[in-house]
Structure formats: structure tokens, C-alpha cells
């Protein structure tokens, strides 16, 4: 949107039963007019739960939301509710777009004129435009990760941002890999963090009227080797109808390169277990974590034979982890019965101690898992 344009959703239309959700960015000083319904039959506008009065700088009137000149405090969520049913007809979030107002050092220091349309906006000290993006104050990240701090702000004239580390000006010149500063995004990025990056990072945002600052704390966690961690509850017990498709999901977390196998427990000569007590299994899928979709097992057009226990086995150079789930396959006529029956929950998690290398892990299957 150019700053000279008026923000307008659409000409006033009869209320739609489908909820309309929009986010609009508006320049400071810009007029806003949003329509919801037609004239007297239009809905009522609310901001943050309070109904807007029909008069004033910001008003809800005859189905219209009208803001004479958009100010920072006007940012937020606006709802238009149908008069009788209170159905949400419009759900609009207005956010500040400060990119449309840029400072010019030659201008009157007491005010700011937008070069695109001649509007004069009052001076304003810096303020945070997206405080929700600054809620995470403490960043505790593993070594080698990327870290991003941001302090999105606005003001008039447009403020500048600079960064401090532990109270000292920070330009990243002593940091291996340097830093990335994006002033338009009000962000500082450090890639491949190391323990020496720990500290307090301060963004300092200032203009001629005032300044604001915010502190972030960075802790860099040195990696400790461990066998793969599998997300609890996955794979999940699943009930499916004959002929349907099934997806079993296994989420694996591992610093060391993990390898994943999907196994189906089978019966051999009437037995599910070998003489050594380990189950008989069939390997359905195997790959490393970088392979697309290895963490998902797809079973297409399932039949009664597909029912049974499935295991996600993940191993790395430190050890093995695995979790199992049951697939129940019902004939189509049992579909209604399934919907009314609570699903029994069973997740088996066994952990092996393994000191041998990665190749030995899956070689060990010959001992621990019978195929």
C-alpha cells in the first residue's frame, strides 16, 4: 500500500456467513475504512472485546470501521459481529507498516513529512511494533545452531538500531563467521554459535525523540552424546478400515547421525519370539534421517494381514532406541463400532546399551531381532 492510499477491504456488502480473516499493514497517519454489511444492517465493530462507539477518531458506524488517521495504539484485532446472531463476519488485524515513512535529514526536526504524499506526521519516540516476537528472552541453544535476535520497532523519524554484547558495542568482528545485521528486519543473526558467544545481547533503538532497549540472554549448550530420542507417543496406536491408507509417524532427535528402520513383528512357526527371547521382525523401511519421509511409514490399501505391531527403531553410534504401536484393521462393516470404542493405548519402549560402532548396531539385529 502506498501511504496516500486509504485502507479499504471492499465496498460495503451484505454479511457473508463465511468468516473473513485478514491482516492489513497500515502506515501511520493513513485513513482506514473497513466495511462489514450494508448500512443499518451492517455488523457491529469491536476492538479487543470492546464495541466501538459511533463517533470519535476511531468509530464503528453503519457497518463501517473508520479511523481518521492511523496511530500506533490503533494496531490490533478488530471483529465485526452480526447484530443478532453475533456471528463473526470480519476478523481483521491491523499492524503498523513503518516502511512507508522514511526520514529526511533536511526536514523540519519537529515533524516528519512523508515524501510520497505530503502528509505531516508528529514526531514519535521509538516503540516496539511486534513485541510478541520478543517474548523469548533467554535463548539456550546447542553449539553449532543459528541464533536470531530481533527488536522490530518504529518511530518518527525512523529510528536506528545498534547492538551491544555485555554492554559493549557489538559488530561481530572478533567472531568467527561474523554476524548478520538486517536493519529493515531489526535483526541480528549469528550462525554456528560457540560457547564464547554466550552473553547478554542488547538492541538499542533510538531516534531524535528518544530511545528504547531490550536484552536477550544467550546460553550455548555444549553437545553431549546420547542415543536417539524418540518423541513420546509415536508411533501411535491406529485403527483403520480395510482398503484405507495409514501413516505411522516416528519423530527422532539425535545429535549423532541416526539411522532409522521400520519393522513389522511377524510370526514364524506359530511363535512371535525366537529362542533368545527377541521378536521376529520384517524390515519394511530403512534409511538415514536425511532421507525424506523416513520418519513416516505409509501403508496403502491396508488388509487384515497388515494388522499387528510395528516398531520404529533408531540407532546412532551411541546406541539404540525404539518404540512400538499396534495397527488394528477392521472390516468396513465394523466402522461404526470403531468410532464408539475407546482405543487401547500401548507403547513399548526398550532401550539397549551399545558401545559398538554404527555398523554394529544394525548388525546386532541378527542377535537382537530375528528377520
Amino acid at each position: 500500500l502506498e501511504a496516500s492510499e486509504e485502507v479499504e477491504l471492499e465496498p460495503c456488502l451484505a454479511p457473508s456467513m463465511e468468516q473473513q480473516e485478514q491482516e492489513l499493514t497500515v502506515a501511520l497517519g493513513q485513513p482506514v475504512r473497513l466495511c462489514c454489511g450494508r448500512a443499518e444492517r451492517g455488523g457491529h465493530w469491536y476492538k479487543e472485546g470492546s464495541r466501538l462507539a459511533p463517533a470519535g477518531r476511531v468509530r464503528g458506524w453503519r457497518g463501517r470501521l473508520e479511523i481518521a488517521s492511523f496511530l500506533p495504539e490503533d494496531a490490533g484485532r478488530y471483529l465485526c459481529l452480526a447484530r443478532a446472531s453475533m456471528i463473526v463476519l470480519q476478523n481483521v488485524t491491523l499492524t503498523i507498516d513503518d516502511s512507508l515513512t522514511s526520514s529526511n535529514d533536511d526536514e523540519d526536526p519537529q515533524s516528519h513529512r512523508d515524501s510520497s504524499n505530503g502528509h505531516i506526521y508528529p514526531q514519535q519516540a521509538p516503540y516496539w511494533t511486534h513485541p510478541q516476537r520478543m517474548e523469548k528472552k533467554l535463548h539456550a541453544v546447542p553449539a553449532g545452531n543459528t541464533v536470531k535476535f530481533r527488536c522490530p520497532a518504529a518511530g518518527n523519524p525512523t529510528p536506528t538500531i545498534r547492538w551491544l554484547k555485555d554492554g559493549q558495542a557489538f559488530h561481530g568482528e572478533n567472531r568467527i563467521g561474523g554476524i548478520r545485521l538486517r536493519h529493515q528486519h531489526w535483526s541480528l543473526v549469528m550462525e554456528s554459535v560457540v560457547p564464547s558467544d554466550r552473553g547478554t545481547y542488547t538492541c538499542l533503538v533510538e531516534n531524535a525523540v528518544g530511545s528504547i532497549r531490550y536484552n536477550y540472554l544467550l546460553d550455548v549448550l555444549e553437545r553431549s552424546p546420547h542415543r536417539p530420542i524418540l518423541q513420546a507417543g509415536l508411533p501411535a496406536n491406529t485403527t483403520a478400515v480395510v482398503g484405507s491408507d495409514v501413516e505411522l509417524l516416528c519423530k527422532v532427535y539425535s545429535d549423532a547421525q541416526p539411522h532409522i528402520q521400520w519393522l513389522k513383528h511377524i510370526v514364524i512357526n506359530g511363535s512371535s519370539f525366537g529362542a533368545d527371547g527377541f521378536p521376529y521382525v520384517q524390515v519394511l523401511k530403512t534409511a538415514d534421517i536425511n532421507s525424506s519421509e523416513v520418519e513416516v511409514l505409509y501403508l496403502r490399501n491396508v488388509s487384515a494381514e497388515d494388522a499387528g505391531e510395528y516398531t520404529c527403531l533408531a540407532g546412532n553410534s551411541i546406541g539404540l532406541s525404539y518404540q512400538s504401536a499396534w495397527l488394528t484393521v477392521l472390516p468396513e462393516e465394523d466402522l461404526t463400532w470403531t468410532a464408539a470404542t475407546p482405543e487401547a493405548r500401548y507403547t513399548d519402549k526398550l532401550e539397549f546399551r551399545h558401545d559398538s560402532g554404527l555398523n554394529d548396531i544394525f548388525e546386532a539385529q541378527k542377535i537382537e531381532w530375528h528377520e
Epitope: 516476537r133 545452531n145 529493515q184
Partner: antibody, heavy 119, light 107 residues
Framework: QVQLLESGGGLVQPGGSLRLSCAAS????????MSWVRQAPGKGLEWVSV????????HYADSVKGRFTISRDNSKNTLYLQMNSLRAEDTAVYYC????????????WGQGTLVTVSS | DIQMTQSPSSLSASVGDRVTITCRAS??????LNWYQQKPGKAPKLLIY???NLQSGVPSRFSGSGSGTDFTLTISSLQPEDFAVYYC?????????FGQGTKVEIK
């Protein structure tokens, strides 16, 4: 309305050079960061490079670092991508895209221009 | 660089189905994730930005959720015009990597 129009694509031999342009209209060009994104035939999207609205910040994908240069001329509302030492794997449709304010979401895209690197 | 992994790589669905596509980042990327739709021979179109914000003009049947490493794009009731390829893209790190794409086909 916002429009982005790429040009400059074509057939070039390996090791050759090409300069892509992206003419922008319908918005205040200098207020927005711009990116190049490419797509090899039958493949997915690959981000190539970004430049801040005032040209103060640039960044490149590892695959093109040292060979490609992104630049802009705000007086002409034009974004450029200078591509040197071209390789067969650079064959793709190249899109220019505008970044949303405060975010790095590409809210407007050009129609793309095809670059073919072949002997 | 931060890797983005989408699943599934393709899926078949019918008009009216609820469709879910997932995207996983190789590290925490906060909510710095966008979703795009691309139809053959066309440029991509922004659907969702910053994980959960619906881009202006995009139908409300599209929604996004997630933060950290795991993200989801949901189409609540698939329409004929929704058959396309969908991509996630992270913008937490300076190199804005895309997922490999998910093709949504007609069953």
C-alpha cells in the same frame, strides 16, 4: 498494483555470464528487501540471494556464493542478478520476489525468466 | 544451513477432504516459517507467513500452526483449485531454505 517483471534469461554456455533484471512497479521499491529464487526444471524452489531495500545488506546461497552478485538501482526501480561462471546446474527459472515488511515472506513474485546453461 | 523436511512428498485426496502437510526444521526456527502454493507453470503464491498468519486474500480454509521445529499447513476442506505443490520456507537463518515440496493430487 504491485508488479515484478524479470528479463535477461536465455541460453548460455558453461562458464559464461548473464545478467538478469527485475523491473518493479506499484510500490515504493526502496522500502522493500528483494530476493531471487530459482527453480530447476521439475524440481523444487531454491532461494538464491537477498538484498535490503537500501542495498546495505546482501546474502547468498552457498551454491552461488562468489559467482553471483545481487544489486539494485532504486532510482530505476530495478533489481539485478549478475551471474558469472555459470554451470549446468544453474539451469532454472529465476524469479524475483518482494519480501514483506518485518518478515522474510515473499508476498509478490515475478513470472520468472528461464536461464539455460548448456554447450 | 538449516534443513527443511516436508512430509509427505505427495498425497492423493478428494475434494472436501481435510489435508495436513508437515514441515520440520533441523533446528529451532521460532515461528520464522512461511507456506507457499505453486501451480504448474506459475510463480509461487504466499499462503501463510510467520507460521500462522494468513496472507491477505488467501481463503480461510488454509491455516498454519507450529513453532520451534515442527510446523503444519492444514487445508480444512480441499477445493478443486487447491491441487498444487506446497512448499515451506524458513527465514530464521540468512539463507532462506525451502522444503522439497508436497504435491497434492486428485484421488
Amino acid at each position: 498494483q504491485v508488479q515484478l517483471l524479470e528479463s535477461g534469461g536465455g541460453l548460455v554456455q558453461p562458464g559464461g555470464s548473464l545478467r538478469l533484471s527485475c523491473a518493479a512497479s506499484g510500490f515504493t521499491f526502496s522500502d522493500y528487501a528483494m530476493s531471487w529464487v530459482r527453480q530447476a526444471p521439475g524440481k523444487g524452489l531454491e532461494w538464491v540471494s537477498v538484498i535490503e531495500g537500501d542495498g546495505s545488506y546482501t546474502h547468498y546461497a552457498d551454491s552461488v556464493k562468489g559467482r553471483f552478485t545481487i544489486s539494485r538501482d532504486n532510482s530505476k526501480n530495478t533489481l539485478y542478478l549478475q551471474m558469472n561462471s555459470l554451470r549446468a546446474e544453474d539451469t532454472a527459472v529465476y524469479y524475483c520476489a518482494r519480501e514483506k515488511t518485518y518478515s522474510s515472506a515473499f508476498d509478490y513474485w515475478g513470472q520468472g525468466t528461464l536461464v539455460t546453461v548448456s554447450s | 544451513d538449516i534443513q527443511m523436511t516436508q512430509s509427505p512428498s505427495s498425497l492423493s485426496a478428494s475434494v472436501g477432504d481435510r489435508v495436513t502437510i508437515t514441515c520440520r526444521a533441523s533446528q529451532d526456527i521460532s515461528s520464522d516459517l512461511n507456506w507457499y502454493q505453486q501451480k504448474p507453470g506459475k510463480a509461487p503464491k504466499l499462503l501463510i507467513y510467520d507460521a500462522s498468519n494468513l496472507q491477505s486474500g488467501v481463503p480461510s480454509r488454509f491455516s498454519g500452526s507450529g513453532s520451534g521445529t515442527d510446523f503444519t499447513l492444514t487445508i480444512s476442506s480441499l477445493q478443486p483449485e487447491d491441487f498444487a505443490v506446497y512448499y515451506c520456507q524458513q527465514h530464521y537463518s540468512p539463507s532462506h531454505t525451502f522444503g522439497q515440496g508436497t504435491k497434492v493430487e486428485i484421488k
